[in-house]
Interface confidence: low
Protein backbone atom coordinates (compact mmCIF):
# COMPACT_ATOMS: atom_id res chain seq x y z
CA UNK A 1 0.00 0.00 0.00
CA UNK A 2 2.91 2.27 0.73
CA UNK A 3 4.41 1.39 -2.68
CA UNK A 4 1.06 1.90 -4.26
CA UNK A 5 0.72 5.38 -2.74
CA UNK A 6 4.20 6.31 -3.88
CA UNK A 7 3.48 5.14 -7.39
CA UNK A 8 0.21 7.07 -7.40
CA UNK A 9 2.00 10.20 -6.28
CA UNK A 10 4.61 9.78 -9.01
CA UNK A 11 1.85 9.19 -11.52
CA UNK A 12 0.10 12.37 -10.43
CA UNK A 13 3.37 14.25 -10.84
CA UNK A 14 3.98 12.74 -14.25
CA UNK A 15 0.45 13.50 -15.35
CA UNK A 16 0.89 17.06 -14.13
CA UNK A 17 4.18 17.37 -15.97
CA UNK A 18 2.64 15.81 -19.10
CA UNK A 19 -0.30 18.25 -18.98
CA UNK A 20 2.10 21.13 -18.43
CA UNK A 21 4.20 19.98 -21.38
CA UNK A 22 1.11 19.55 -23.51
CA UNK A 23 0.09 23.11 -22.59
CA UNK A 24 3.56 24.34 -23.49
CA UNK A 25 3.39 22.46 -26.81
CA UNK A 26 -0.02 23.93 -27.55
CA UNK A 27 1.28 27.45 -26.76
CA UNK A 28 4.35 26.85 -28.85
CA UNK A 29 2.18 25.55 -31.68
CA UNK A 30 0.08 28.71 -31.57
CA UNK A 31 3.22 30.87 -31.45
CA UNK A 32 4.66 28.90 -34.34
CA UNK A 33 1.51 29.36 -36.35
CA UNK A 34 1.57 33.11 -35.56
CA UNK A 35 5.27 33.23 -36.46
CA UNK A 36 4.55 31.39 -39.71
CA UNK A 37 1.82 33.86 -40.46
CA UNK A 38 4.11 36.79 -39.66
CA UNK A 39 6.83 35.21 -41.82
CA UNK A 40 4.39 34.83 -44.68
CA UNK A 41 3.40 38.46 -44.26
CA UNK A 42 7.06 39.48 -44.30
CA UNK A 43 7.65 37.40 -47.42
CA UNK A 44 4.66 39.03 -49.06
CA UNK A 45 5.99 42.42 -48.05
CA UNK A 46 9.36 41.53 -49.58
CA UNK A 47 7.68 40.38 -52.78
CA UNK A 48 5.74 43.65 -52.96
CA UNK A 49 8.83 45.75 -52.29
CA UNK A 50 10.89 43.79 -54.83
CA UNK A 51 8.15 44.27 -57.41
CA UNK A 52 7.92 47.98 -56.62
CA UNK A 53 11.71 48.30 -56.85
CA UNK A 54 11.69 46.52 -60.18
CA UNK A 55 8.95 48.82 -61.45
CA UNK A 56 10.82 51.87 -60.20
CA UNK A 57 13.97 50.63 -61.96
CA UNK A 58 12.01 50.22 -65.19
CA UNK A 59 10.50 53.71 -64.82
CA UNK A 60 13.91 55.13 -64.01
CA UNK A 61 15.42 53.43 -67.06
CA UNK A 62 12.65 54.90 -69.17
CA UNK A 63 13.18 58.37 -67.69
CA UNK A 64 16.92 58.01 -68.25
CA UNK A 65 16.31 57.17 -71.92
CA UNK A 66 13.89 60.08 -72.19
CA UNK A 67 16.58 62.29 -70.66
CA UNK A 68 19.21 61.12 -73.12
CA UNK A 69 16.79 61.67 -76.01
CA UNK A 70 15.95 65.14 -74.74
CA UNK A 71 19.64 65.98 -74.39
CA UNK A 72 20.26 64.70 -77.92
CA UNK A 73 17.33 66.73 -79.23
CA UNK A 74 18.58 69.74 -77.30
CA UNK A 75 22.00 69.41 -78.95
CA UNK A 76 20.36 69.11 -82.35
CA UNK A 77 17.95 71.94 -81.70
CA UNK A 78 20.78 74.13 -80.43
CA UNK A 79 22.41 73.49 -83.79
CA UNK A 80 19.16 73.77 -85.68
CA UNK A 81 18.35 77.05 -84.06
CA UNK A 82 21.72 78.50 -85.07
CA UNK A 83 21.34 80.07 -88.50
CA UNK A 84 24.74 78.67 -89.53
CA UNK A 85 27.08 75.91 -88.37
CA UNK A 86 30.24 76.68 -86.41
CA UNK A 87 33.03 78.46 -88.33
CA UNK A 88 30.59 79.79 -90.96
CA UNK A 89 29.64 83.47 -91.29
CA UNK A 90 25.94 84.29 -91.23
CA UNK A 91 25.01 87.20 -93.49
CA UNK A 92 21.40 88.01 -94.43
CA UNK A 93 19.86 84.78 -95.76
CA UNK A 94 23.10 82.87 -96.28
CA UNK A 95 25.96 81.15 -94.51
CA UNK A 96 29.47 81.51 -95.91
CA UNK A 97 32.60 79.46 -95.28
CA UNK A 98 36.03 80.61 -96.38
CA UNK A 99 38.09 77.53 -97.14
CA UNK A 100 41.40 77.07 -95.38
CA UNK A 101 42.83 74.86 -98.11
CA UNK A 102 43.66 75.55 -101.72
CA UNK A 103 42.23 73.32 -104.48
CA UNK A 104 41.21 73.39 -108.14
CA UNK A 105 37.67 74.51 -109.00
CA UNK A 106 36.17 71.02 -109.25
CA UNK A 107 37.72 69.86 -105.97
CA UNK A 108 36.55 73.09 -104.31
CA UNK A 109 33.04 72.38 -105.59
CA UNK A 110 33.19 68.85 -104.11
CA UNK A 111 34.35 70.22 -100.76
CA UNK A 112 31.34 72.57 -100.65
CA UNK A 113 28.96 69.78 -101.66
CA UNK A 114 30.30 67.60 -98.84
CA UNK A 115 29.25 70.42 -96.48
CA UNK A 116 25.76 70.52 -98.00
CA UNK A 117 26.67 73.79 -99.72
CA UNK A 118 27.66 75.21 -103.10
CA UNK A 119 30.40 77.53 -104.27
CA UNK A 120 29.67 81.23 -103.81
CA UNK A 121 26.86 82.72 -105.88
CA UNK A 122 26.51 86.50 -106.06
CA UNK A 123 22.91 87.55 -106.65
CA UNK A 124 23.09 91.25 -105.92
CA UNK A 125 25.41 94.19 -105.44
CA UNK A 126 24.72 93.83 -101.67
CA UNK A 127 26.08 90.25 -101.83
CA UNK A 128 29.10 91.52 -103.76
CA UNK A 129 29.70 94.30 -101.19
CA UNK A 130 29.60 91.82 -98.33
CA UNK A 131 32.04 89.42 -100.02
CA UNK A 132 34.39 92.23 -101.04
CA UNK A 133 34.42 93.41 -97.44
CA UNK A 134 34.85 89.90 -96.03
CA UNK A 135 37.95 89.27 -98.17
CA UNK A 136 39.30 92.81 -97.91
CA UNK A 137 42.19 91.67 -95.74
CA UNK A 138 43.23 88.86 -98.09
CA UNK A 139 45.41 89.11 -101.17
CA UNK A 140 44.57 85.58 -102.31
CA UNK A 141 42.07 84.43 -104.95
CA UNK A 142 38.83 82.62 -104.01
CA UNK A 143 36.91 80.40 -106.44
CA UNK A 144 33.23 81.20 -106.83
CA UNK A 145 30.52 79.02 -108.39
CA UNK A 146 30.72 80.65 -111.80
CA UNK A 147 32.17 78.93 -114.86
CA UNK A 148 31.84 78.44 -118.62
CA UNK A 149 32.97 75.71 -120.98
CA UNK A 150 34.67 78.06 -123.43
CA UNK A 151 34.46 81.71 -124.58
CA UNK A 152 31.47 81.04 -126.85
CA UNK A 153 29.39 79.76 -123.91
CA UNK A 154 27.68 82.00 -121.35
CA UNK A 155 28.90 82.33 -117.77
CA UNK A 156 26.69 80.11 -115.60
CA UNK A 157 26.29 79.66 -111.85
CA UNK A 158 26.28 76.10 -110.47
CA UNK A 159 22.47 76.04 -110.43
CA UNK A 160 22.47 76.75 -114.18
CA UNK A 161 21.35 80.36 -113.91
CA UNK A 162 23.21 82.94 -116.04
CA UNK A 163 25.33 85.77 -114.68
CA UNK A 164 23.48 89.09 -114.54
CA UNK A 165 25.66 91.40 -116.68
CA UNK A 166 25.26 94.47 -114.46
CA UNK A 167 26.74 92.77 -111.35
CA UNK A 168 30.43 92.84 -112.19
CA UNK A 169 32.86 92.79 -115.07
CA UNK A 170 35.01 89.68 -115.43
CA UNK A 171 38.66 90.51 -116.04
CA UNK A 172 41.66 88.38 -116.95
CA UNK A 173 41.68 85.37 -119.26
CA UNK A 174 38.14 85.88 -120.57
CA UNK A 175 38.95 84.88 -124.16
CA UNK A 176 41.18 81.90 -123.28
CA UNK A 177 40.04 78.32 -123.90
CA UNK A 178 41.13 75.74 -121.31
CA UNK A 179 40.57 71.95 -121.46
CA UNK A 180 39.12 72.07 -117.93
CA UNK A 181 36.98 75.12 -118.73
CA UNK A 182 37.18 78.69 -117.49
CA UNK A 183 36.21 79.48 -113.91
CA UNK A 184 35.75 82.74 -112.02
CA UNK A 185 37.52 83.77 -108.86
CA UNK A 186 37.28 86.88 -106.73
CA UNK A 187 40.46 88.59 -105.55
CA UNK A 188 40.80 91.96 -103.81
CA UNK A 189 37.21 92.72 -104.76
CA UNK A 190 37.54 92.09 -108.50
CA UNK A 191 36.39 89.02 -110.45
CA UNK A 192 38.77 87.22 -112.81
CA UNK A 193 38.50 84.40 -115.34
CA UNK A 194 41.06 81.61 -114.95
CA UNK A 195 41.89 78.02 -115.86
CA UNK A 196 39.71 75.81 -113.60
CA UNK A 197 42.65 73.46 -113.06
CA UNK A 198 44.55 75.98 -110.93
CA UNK A 199 44.44 75.86 -107.13
CA UNK A 200 42.87 78.66 -105.12
CA UNK A 201 40.98 79.17 -101.88
CA UNK A 202 37.19 79.05 -102.18
CA UNK A 203 33.98 80.34 -100.61
CA UNK A 204 31.14 77.92 -99.85
CA UNK A 205 27.61 79.18 -99.42
CA UNK A 206 24.33 77.71 -98.18
CA UNK A 207 20.95 78.97 -97.03
CA UNK A 208 20.85 80.11 -93.41
CA UNK A 209 18.44 78.25 -91.14
CA UNK A 210 16.12 81.13 -90.34
CA UNK A 211 13.05 79.05 -89.38
CA UNK A 212 11.56 79.56 -85.89
CA UNK A 213 14.42 81.71 -84.71
CA UNK B 1 0.81 -6.48 -6.58
CA UNK B 2 -1.43 -6.38 -9.62
CA UNK B 3 -2.31 -2.73 -8.85
CA UNK B 4 1.32 -2.05 -8.39
CA UNK B 5 2.16 -3.54 -11.76
CA UNK B 6 -0.60 -1.54 -13.41
CA UNK B 7 0.63 1.67 -11.81
CA UNK B 8 4.20 0.90 -12.90
CA UNK B 9 2.99 0.35 -16.43
CA UNK B 10 1.06 3.64 -16.43
CA UNK B 11 4.12 5.35 -14.97
CA UNK B 12 6.30 3.96 -17.76
CA UNK B 13 3.74 5.20 -20.32
CA UNK B 14 3.63 8.63 -18.71
CA UNK B 15 7.43 8.84 -18.54
CA UNK B 16 7.57 7.89 -22.20
CA UNK B 17 4.94 10.48 -23.08
CA UNK B 18 6.76 13.08 -20.97
CA UNK B 19 10.05 12.33 -22.70
CA UNK B 20 8.33 12.47 -26.07
CA UNK B 21 6.73 15.80 -25.19
CA UNK B 22 10.06 17.16 -23.94
CA UNK B 23 11.62 16.09 -27.25
CA UNK B 24 8.82 17.84 -29.11
CA UNK B 25 9.31 20.96 -27.03
CA UNK B 26 13.05 20.93 -27.65
CA UNK B 27 12.43 20.54 -31.42
CA UNK B 28 9.83 23.28 -31.34
CA UNK B 29 12.26 25.53 -29.44
CA UNK B 30 14.94 25.02 -32.12
CA UNK B 31 12.39 25.61 -34.90
CA UNK B 32 11.22 28.71 -33.10
CA UNK B 33 14.78 30.03 -32.82
CA UNK B 34 15.36 29.30 -36.52
CA UNK B 35 12.06 30.97 -37.37
CA UNK B 36 13.09 33.99 -35.31
CA UNK B 37 16.41 34.14 -37.14
CA UNK B 38 14.64 33.81 -40.50
CA UNK B 39 12.21 36.50 -39.46
CA UNK B 40 15.05 38.84 -38.52
CA UNK B 41 16.64 38.17 -41.91
CA UNK B 42 13.34 38.93 -43.64
CA UNK B 43 13.00 42.14 -41.65
CA UNK B 44 16.54 43.14 -42.64
CA UNK B 45 15.73 42.36 -46.26
CA UNK B 46 12.60 44.50 -46.00
CA UNK B 47 14.62 47.37 -44.53
CA UNK B 48 17.17 47.10 -47.36
CA UNK B 49 14.45 46.96 -50.02
CA UNK B 50 12.59 49.87 -48.46
CA UNK B 51 15.81 51.93 -48.41
CA UNK B 52 16.56 50.99 -52.04
CA UNK B 53 13.03 51.89 -53.04
CA UNK B 54 13.33 55.21 -51.25
CA UNK B 55 16.65 55.93 -53.04
CA UNK B 56 15.14 54.94 -56.39
CA UNK B 57 12.21 57.26 -55.72
CA UNK B 58 14.59 60.11 -54.97
CA UNK B 59 16.61 59.38 -58.13
CA UNK B 60 13.41 59.14 -60.13
CA UNK B 61 12.18 62.42 -58.73
CA UNK B 62 15.50 64.00 -59.68
CA UNK B 63 15.35 62.52 -63.20
CA UNK B 64 11.77 63.70 -63.48
CA UNK B 65 12.82 67.26 -62.58
CA UNK B 66 15.71 67.02 -65.02
CA UNK B 67 13.25 65.91 -67.66
CA UNK B 68 10.90 68.78 -66.95
CA UNK B 69 13.82 71.22 -67.07
CA UNK B 70 15.04 69.73 -70.35
CA UNK B 71 11.55 69.98 -71.81
CA UNK B 72 11.36 73.59 -70.64
CA UNK B 73 14.78 74.33 -72.09
CA UNK B 74 13.81 72.63 -75.30
CA UNK B 75 10.75 74.83 -75.61
CA UNK B 76 12.83 77.92 -74.94
CA UNK B 77 15.73 76.87 -77.19
CA UNK B 78 13.32 76.29 -80.05
CA UNK B 79 12.73 80.03 -79.83
CA UNK B 80 16.30 80.95 -78.96
CA UNK B 81 18.35 83.47 -80.87
CA UNK B 82 21.47 82.78 -82.93
CA UNK B 83 24.73 82.05 -81.07
CA UNK B 84 26.38 85.00 -82.85
CA UNK B 85 25.23 88.14 -84.66
CA UNK B 86 25.37 88.43 -88.45
CA UNK B 87 28.86 88.67 -90.01
CA UNK B 88 30.49 87.09 -86.93
CA UNK B 89 32.01 83.60 -86.94
CA UNK B 90 30.76 81.18 -84.29
CA UNK B 91 33.48 78.83 -83.03
CA UNK B 92 33.10 76.70 -79.88
CA UNK B 93 32.02 79.08 -77.09
CA UNK B 94 32.91 82.33 -78.83
CA UNK B 95 31.96 84.68 -81.63
CA UNK B 96 34.68 86.35 -83.68
CA UNK B 97 34.55 89.38 -85.96
CA UNK B 98 37.38 90.27 -88.31
CA UNK B 99 37.39 94.04 -88.68
CA UNK B 100 37.24 95.52 -92.16
CA UNK B 101 38.92 98.77 -91.15
CA UNK B 102 42.43 99.53 -90.00
CA UNK B 103 42.90 101.42 -86.69
CA UNK B 104 45.37 101.82 -83.85
CA UNK B 105 45.08 99.45 -80.87
CA UNK B 106 43.05 101.77 -78.64
CA UNK B 107 40.60 102.64 -81.42
CA UNK B 108 40.31 98.93 -82.28
CA UNK B 109 39.54 98.22 -78.62
CA UNK B 110 36.82 100.90 -78.66
CA UNK B 111 35.31 99.42 -81.84
CA UNK B 112 35.07 96.02 -80.15
CA UNK B 113 33.58 97.53 -76.98
CA UNK B 114 30.93 99.28 -79.06
CA UNK B 115 29.94 95.81 -80.32
CA UNK B 116 29.74 94.48 -76.74
CA UNK B 117 32.98 92.57 -77.32
CA UNK B 118 36.68 92.68 -76.55
CA UNK B 119 39.78 92.29 -78.64
CA UNK B 120 40.83 88.69 -79.29
CA UNK B 121 41.98 86.65 -76.29
CA UNK B 122 43.73 83.34 -76.90
CA UNK B 123 43.20 80.90 -74.02
CA UNK B 124 44.43 77.66 -75.54
CA UNK B 125 46.35 76.13 -78.40
CA UNK B 126 42.96 75.14 -79.86
CA UNK B 127 41.96 78.85 -79.91
CA UNK B 128 45.31 79.68 -81.53
CA UNK B 129 44.85 76.95 -84.16
CA UNK B 130 41.39 78.28 -85.05
CA UNK B 131 42.62 81.88 -85.40
CA UNK B 132 45.70 80.86 -87.39
CA UNK B 133 43.43 78.92 -89.75
CA UNK B 134 40.89 81.74 -89.97
CA UNK B 135 43.56 84.27 -91.02
CA UNK B 136 45.60 81.81 -93.11
CA UNK B 137 44.58 83.50 -96.35
CA UNK B 138 45.48 86.98 -95.12
CA UNK B 139 48.89 88.63 -95.15
CA UNK B 140 47.73 91.46 -92.91
CA UNK B 141 48.34 92.11 -89.21
CA UNK B 142 45.43 91.87 -86.73
CA UNK B 143 45.51 93.47 -83.28
CA UNK B 144 44.65 91.18 -80.39
CA UNK B 145 43.74 92.14 -76.78
CA UNK B 146 47.27 91.72 -75.43
CA UNK B 147 49.46 94.63 -74.34
CA UNK B 148 52.03 95.83 -71.84
CA UNK B 149 53.08 99.28 -70.61
CA UNK B 150 56.77 98.71 -71.15
CA UNK B 151 59.27 95.82 -71.31
CA UNK B 152 59.53 95.54 -67.50
CA UNK B 153 55.76 94.92 -67.23
CA UNK B 154 54.10 91.56 -67.95
CA UNK B 155 51.96 90.96 -71.03
CA UNK B 156 48.31 91.24 -69.97
CA UNK B 157 45.00 90.50 -71.67
CA UNK B 158 42.28 93.15 -71.52
CA UNK B 159 40.64 91.39 -68.55
CA UNK B 160 43.92 91.74 -66.61
CA UNK B 161 44.92 88.08 -66.82
CA UNK B 162 48.53 87.31 -67.73
CA UNK B 163 49.65 85.58 -70.92
CA UNK B 164 50.35 81.85 -70.43
CA UNK B 165 53.98 81.50 -71.55
CA UNK B 166 53.51 78.15 -73.33
CA UNK B 167 50.89 79.48 -75.77
CA UNK B 168 53.09 81.38 -78.22
CA UNK B 169 56.33 83.29 -78.49
CA UNK B 170 56.06 87.03 -79.12
CA UNK B 171 58.45 88.21 -81.82
CA UNK B 172 59.42 91.65 -83.04
CA UNK B 173 59.79 94.79 -80.92
CA UNK B 174 59.60 93.02 -77.55
CA UNK B 175 62.25 95.17 -75.86
CA UNK B 176 61.11 98.54 -77.30
CA UNK B 177 59.45 101.19 -75.11
CA UNK B 178 56.66 103.27 -76.68
CA UNK B 179 54.73 106.19 -75.14
CA UNK B 180 51.46 104.46 -76.10
CA UNK B 181 52.67 101.07 -74.85
CA UNK B 182 53.45 97.85 -76.68
CA UNK B 183 50.63 95.82 -78.20
CA UNK B 184 50.50 92.39 -79.78
CA UNK B 185 49.24 91.56 -83.25
CA UNK B 186 48.89 88.26 -85.08
CA UNK B 187 50.04 88.01 -88.67
CA UNK B 188 50.33 84.89 -90.80
CA UNK B 189 50.02 82.74 -87.68
CA UNK B 190 52.80 84.41 -85.66
CA UNK B 191 52.43 86.95 -82.84
CA UNK B 192 54.44 90.20 -82.86
CA UNK B 193 54.97 93.11 -80.48
CA UNK B 194 54.45 96.57 -81.95
CA UNK B 195 53.83 100.22 -81.13
CA UNK B 196 50.14 100.49 -80.13
CA UNK B 197 49.86 103.72 -82.14
CA UNK B 198 50.14 101.89 -85.47
CA UNK B 199 47.05 101.01 -87.49
CA UNK B 200 46.11 97.41 -88.21
CA UNK B 201 43.04 95.25 -88.69
CA UNK B 202 41.67 93.64 -85.52
CA UNK B 203 39.71 90.65 -84.25
CA UNK B 204 36.83 91.18 -81.82
CA UNK B 205 35.59 88.35 -79.63
CA UNK B 206 32.60 87.77 -77.39
CA UNK B 207 30.86 84.84 -75.73
CA UNK B 208 28.49 82.95 -78.00
CA UNK B 209 24.85 82.95 -76.88
CA UNK B 210 24.63 79.24 -76.01
CA UNK B 211 22.42 79.60 -72.92
CA UNK B 212 18.93 78.22 -73.09
CA UNK B 213 17.09 81.43 -73.86
Amino acid sequence: SQVSNLLKQQQTNLTHQKNKLEGQISARQQAEEASQESQNELKEMIETLAWKLNEKSKEQMELHHQNLNLQETLKRVANCSAPCPQDWIWHEENCYLFSTGSFNWEKSQEKCLSLDAKLLKINSTADLDFIQQAISYSSFPFWMGLSRRNPSYPWLWEDGSPLMPHLFRIRGAVSQTYPSGTCAYIQRGAVYAENCILAAFSICQKKANLRAQ
Amino acid sequence: SQVSNLLKQQQTNLTHQKNKLEGQISARQQAEEASQESQNELKEMIETLAWKLNEKSKEQMELHHQNLNLQETLKRVANCSAPCPQDWIWHEENCYLFSTGSFNWEKSQEKCLSLDAKLLKINSTADLDFIQQAISYSSFPFWMGLSRRNPSYPWLWEDGSPLMPHLFRIRGAVSQTYPSGTCAYIQRGAVYAENCILAAFSICQKKANLRAQ
Partner: antibody
Protein backbone atom coordinates in the same frame (compact mmCIF):
# COMPACT_ATOMS: atom_id res chain seq x y z
CA UNK C 1 70.27 78.14 -90.36
CA UNK C 2 67.64 79.39 -92.80
CA UNK C 3 68.59 78.87 -96.46
CA UNK C 4 66.82 79.27 -99.79
CA UNK C 5 68.64 77.61 -102.67
CA UNK C 6 67.47 78.36 -106.22
CA UNK C 7 67.93 76.43 -109.46
CA UNK C 8 70.60 77.44 -111.98
CA UNK C 9 70.57 80.02 -114.77
CA UNK C 10 68.32 79.44 -117.80
CA UNK C 11 68.39 80.65 -121.40
CA UNK C 12 65.00 80.58 -123.14
CA UNK C 13 63.53 81.57 -126.48
CA UNK C 14 60.60 84.05 -126.66
CA UNK C 15 57.26 82.28 -126.26
CA UNK C 16 58.77 79.48 -124.14
CA UNK C 17 58.23 78.85 -120.40
CA UNK C 18 60.66 78.74 -117.51
CA UNK C 19 60.22 77.06 -114.13
CA UNK C 20 62.49 78.23 -111.31
CA UNK C 21 62.74 76.20 -108.10
CA UNK C 22 63.52 77.37 -104.57
CA UNK C 23 64.44 74.78 -101.93
CA UNK C 24 63.97 75.90 -98.33
CA UNK C 25 65.75 74.54 -95.26
CA UNK C 26 66.35 75.51 -91.62
CA UNK C 27 62.71 76.39 -90.82
CA UNK C 28 59.17 75.02 -91.13
CA UNK C 29 58.42 75.50 -94.83
CA UNK C 30 54.63 75.66 -94.41
CA UNK C 31 54.80 78.49 -91.82
CA UNK C 32 56.04 81.29 -94.07
CA UNK C 33 54.92 82.64 -97.43
CA UNK C 34 57.42 82.39 -100.28
CA UNK C 35 57.55 85.54 -102.39
CA UNK C 36 59.05 86.02 -105.85
CA UNK C 37 60.82 89.24 -106.80
CA UNK C 38 62.60 89.94 -110.08
CA UNK C 39 65.23 92.44 -111.13
CA UNK C 40 65.90 93.28 -114.75
CA UNK C 41 69.55 94.19 -115.58
CA UNK C 42 70.37 97.62 -114.12
CA UNK C 43 66.77 98.05 -112.91
CA UNK C 44 64.97 98.08 -109.58
CA UNK C 45 63.16 95.30 -107.70
CA UNK C 46 59.71 94.14 -108.87
CA UNK C 47 57.39 92.05 -106.70
CA UNK C 48 55.68 89.28 -108.73
CA UNK C 49 53.55 87.47 -106.19
CA UNK C 50 53.56 84.97 -103.36
CA UNK C 51 52.49 81.47 -102.40
CA UNK C 52 51.25 80.27 -99.03
CA UNK C 53 53.01 76.86 -98.76
CA UNK C 54 50.66 75.64 -96.02
CA UNK C 55 47.57 75.90 -98.21
CA UNK C 56 48.93 76.37 -101.71
CA UNK C 57 47.01 79.65 -102.16
CA UNK C 58 48.82 82.14 -104.38
CA UNK C 59 48.56 85.87 -105.10
CA UNK C 60 49.97 87.33 -108.32
CA UNK C 61 50.55 90.87 -109.54
CA UNK C 62 47.94 91.76 -112.15
CA UNK C 63 50.66 92.38 -114.73
CA UNK C 64 51.68 88.68 -114.59
CA UNK C 65 48.19 87.24 -114.17
CA UNK C 66 47.64 84.35 -116.59
CA UNK C 67 51.39 84.02 -117.29
CA UNK C 68 52.74 83.16 -113.88
CA UNK C 69 51.99 80.09 -111.75
CA UNK C 70 53.38 79.59 -108.27
CA UNK C 71 53.26 76.10 -106.81
CA UNK C 72 54.94 74.18 -104.02
CA UNK C 73 55.86 70.62 -103.03
CA UNK C 74 55.75 70.46 -99.23
CA UNK C 75 57.29 66.96 -99.17
CA UNK C 76 60.60 68.43 -100.40
CA UNK C 77 60.11 71.99 -99.01
CA UNK C 78 60.37 73.49 -102.47
CA UNK C 79 58.50 76.38 -104.09
CA UNK C 80 58.27 76.86 -107.86
CA UNK C 81 57.61 79.86 -110.07
CA UNK C 82 56.70 79.21 -113.68
CA UNK C 83 56.51 82.06 -116.17
CA UNK C 84 55.06 81.29 -119.59
CA UNK C 85 54.92 83.09 -122.95
CA UNK C 86 58.33 84.62 -122.25
CA UNK C 87 59.33 87.92 -123.86
CA UNK C 88 62.73 89.56 -124.07
CA UNK C 89 61.78 92.03 -121.31
CA UNK C 90 61.37 89.05 -118.93
CA UNK C 91 65.18 88.78 -118.89
CA UNK C 92 66.01 89.28 -115.22
CA UNK C 93 67.35 87.75 -112.04
CA UNK C 94 64.46 86.01 -110.27
CA UNK C 95 64.65 85.82 -106.49
CA UNK C 96 62.59 83.73 -104.09
CA UNK C 97 62.35 85.08 -100.56
CA UNK C 98 60.85 84.17 -97.19
CA UNK C 99 58.37 86.76 -96.09
CA UNK C 100 57.62 88.74 -92.98
CA UNK C 101 59.06 91.00 -94.09
CA UNK C 102 61.57 89.53 -96.56
CA UNK C 103 64.30 88.45 -94.18
CA UNK C 104 65.88 85.64 -96.20
CA UNK C 105 66.50 85.58 -99.96
CA UNK C 106 67.58 82.95 -102.45
CA UNK C 107 70.80 83.60 -104.36
CA UNK C 108 68.81 84.50 -107.50
CA UNK C 109 68.35 82.75 -110.85
CA UNK C 110 69.26 84.56 -114.05
CA UNK C 111 66.71 83.92 -116.82
CA UNK C 112 67.78 85.18 -120.23
CA UNK C 113 65.16 85.39 -122.98
CA UNK C 114 66.76 85.70 -126.36
CA UNK C 115 66.06 84.52 -129.88
CA UNK D 1 48.23 99.78 -106.65
CA UNK D 2 50.24 101.86 -104.17
CA UNK D 3 53.07 103.79 -105.85
CA UNK D 4 56.31 104.21 -103.91
CA UNK D 5 58.51 107.17 -104.90
CA UNK D 6 62.07 107.36 -103.57
CA UNK D 7 64.24 110.45 -103.56
CA UNK D 8 66.89 111.19 -104.46
CA UNK D 9 67.51 108.57 -107.15
CA UNK D 10 71.23 108.82 -106.36
CA UNK D 11 73.28 110.49 -103.65
CA UNK D 12 76.99 111.08 -103.22
CA UNK D 13 78.38 111.61 -99.72
CA UNK D 14 81.62 111.41 -97.77
CA UNK D 15 82.57 108.91 -95.07
CA UNK D 16 81.18 110.16 -91.75
CA UNK D 17 78.36 112.16 -93.38
CA UNK D 18 74.74 111.91 -92.30
CA UNK D 19 72.68 110.55 -95.22
CA UNK D 20 68.90 110.74 -95.56
CA UNK D 21 66.77 108.89 -98.14
CA UNK D 22 63.02 109.48 -98.35
CA UNK D 23 60.19 107.34 -99.58
CA UNK D 24 56.68 108.60 -100.32
CA UNK D 25 53.65 106.32 -100.70
CA UNK D 26 50.68 107.27 -102.91
CA UNK D 27 48.42 106.56 -99.91
CA UNK D 28 48.86 106.05 -96.15
CA UNK D 29 50.56 102.75 -95.38
CA UNK D 30 50.35 102.79 -91.56
CA UNK D 31 54.11 102.23 -91.10
CA UNK D 32 54.02 98.88 -92.95
CA UNK D 33 57.26 99.72 -94.71
CA UNK D 34 60.67 98.04 -95.05
CA UNK D 35 64.09 99.24 -96.20
CA UNK D 36 66.52 96.98 -98.05
CA UNK D 37 70.18 97.41 -98.96
CA UNK D 38 71.47 95.77 -102.17
CA UNK D 39 75.10 95.50 -103.19
CA UNK D 40 76.03 94.72 -106.83
CA UNK D 41 75.51 91.08 -107.79
CA UNK D 42 73.95 90.22 -104.40
CA UNK D 43 70.44 89.63 -103.13
CA UNK D 44 68.89 92.51 -101.13
CA UNK D 45 69.36 92.58 -97.35
CA UNK D 46 66.68 93.63 -94.85
CA UNK D 47 67.67 96.69 -92.78
CA UNK D 48 64.46 97.92 -91.12
CA UNK D 49 60.85 96.80 -90.96
CA UNK D 50 57.65 98.43 -89.65
CA UNK D 51 59.29 101.72 -90.75
CA UNK D 52 61.61 101.95 -87.74
CA UNK D 53 62.35 98.43 -86.42
CA UNK D 54 66.03 97.60 -86.86
CA UNK D 55 66.63 94.03 -88.09
CA UNK D 56 68.98 92.12 -85.78
CA UNK D 57 72.61 92.34 -86.83
CA UNK D 58 72.13 95.67 -88.63
CA UNK D 59 74.42 98.46 -87.33
CA UNK D 60 72.71 101.10 -85.17
CA UNK D 61 73.84 103.93 -87.51
CA UNK D 62 70.82 102.94 -89.63
CA UNK D 63 67.48 104.28 -88.43
CA UNK D 64 64.02 104.77 -89.85
CA UNK D 65 61.17 107.13 -89.15
CA UNK D 66 57.96 108.49 -90.63
CA UNK D 67 54.22 107.92 -90.66
CA UNK D 68 51.27 108.08 -93.01
CA UNK D 69 52.72 108.49 -96.50
CA UNK D 70 56.23 109.84 -95.79
CA UNK D 71 59.14 107.75 -94.53
CA UNK D 72 62.88 108.31 -94.09
CA UNK D 73 65.97 106.12 -93.90
CA UNK D 74 68.91 107.78 -92.12
CA UNK D 75 72.54 106.68 -91.97
CA UNK D 76 73.99 108.76 -89.11
CA UNK D 77 77.64 108.33 -90.08
CA UNK D 78 78.36 106.93 -93.54
CA UNK D 79 80.84 104.04 -93.71
CA UNK D 80 82.59 102.73 -96.86
CA UNK D 81 80.70 99.40 -96.61
CA UNK D 82 77.38 101.29 -96.87
CA UNK D 83 77.92 101.87 -100.59
CA UNK D 84 74.90 100.17 -102.18
CA UNK D 85 71.43 100.78 -103.62
CA UNK D 86 68.63 101.23 -101.06
CA UNK D 87 65.02 100.27 -101.67
CA UNK D 88 61.84 100.90 -99.70
CA UNK D 89 58.84 98.55 -100.01
CA UNK D 90 55.31 98.83 -98.64
CA UNK D 91 53.68 95.68 -97.29
CA UNK D 92 50.24 96.94 -96.39
CA UNK D 93 48.42 95.87 -99.53
CA UNK D 94 49.38 93.58 -102.40
CA UNK D 95 51.01 94.08 -104.79
CA UNK D 96 53.83 94.88 -102.35
CA UNK D 97 55.43 97.64 -104.37
CA UNK D 98 59.05 98.80 -104.18
CA UNK D 99 60.46 102.28 -104.59
CA UNK D 100 62.69 102.68 -107.68
CA UNK D 101 65.85 102.68 -105.53
CA UNK D 102 68.44 105.20 -104.36
CA UNK D 103 72.05 104.63 -105.35
CA UNK D 104 74.50 105.74 -102.65
CA UNK D 105 78.09 106.55 -103.68
CA UNK D 106 81.16 107.80 -101.84
CA UNK D 107 82.48 111.22 -102.85
Amino acid sequence: QVQLVQSGAEVKKPGASVKVSCKASGYTFTDYEVHWVRQAPGQGLEWMGAIHPGSGGAAYVQKFQGRVTMTRDTSISTAYMELSRLRSDDTAVYYCARWLPIDYWGQGTLVTVSS
Amino acid sequence: DIQMTQSPSSVSASVGDRVTITCRASQGINNWLVWYQQKPGKAPKLLLYAASRLESGVPSRFSGSGSGTDYTLTISSLQPEDIATYYCQQYLITPYTFGQGTKLEIK
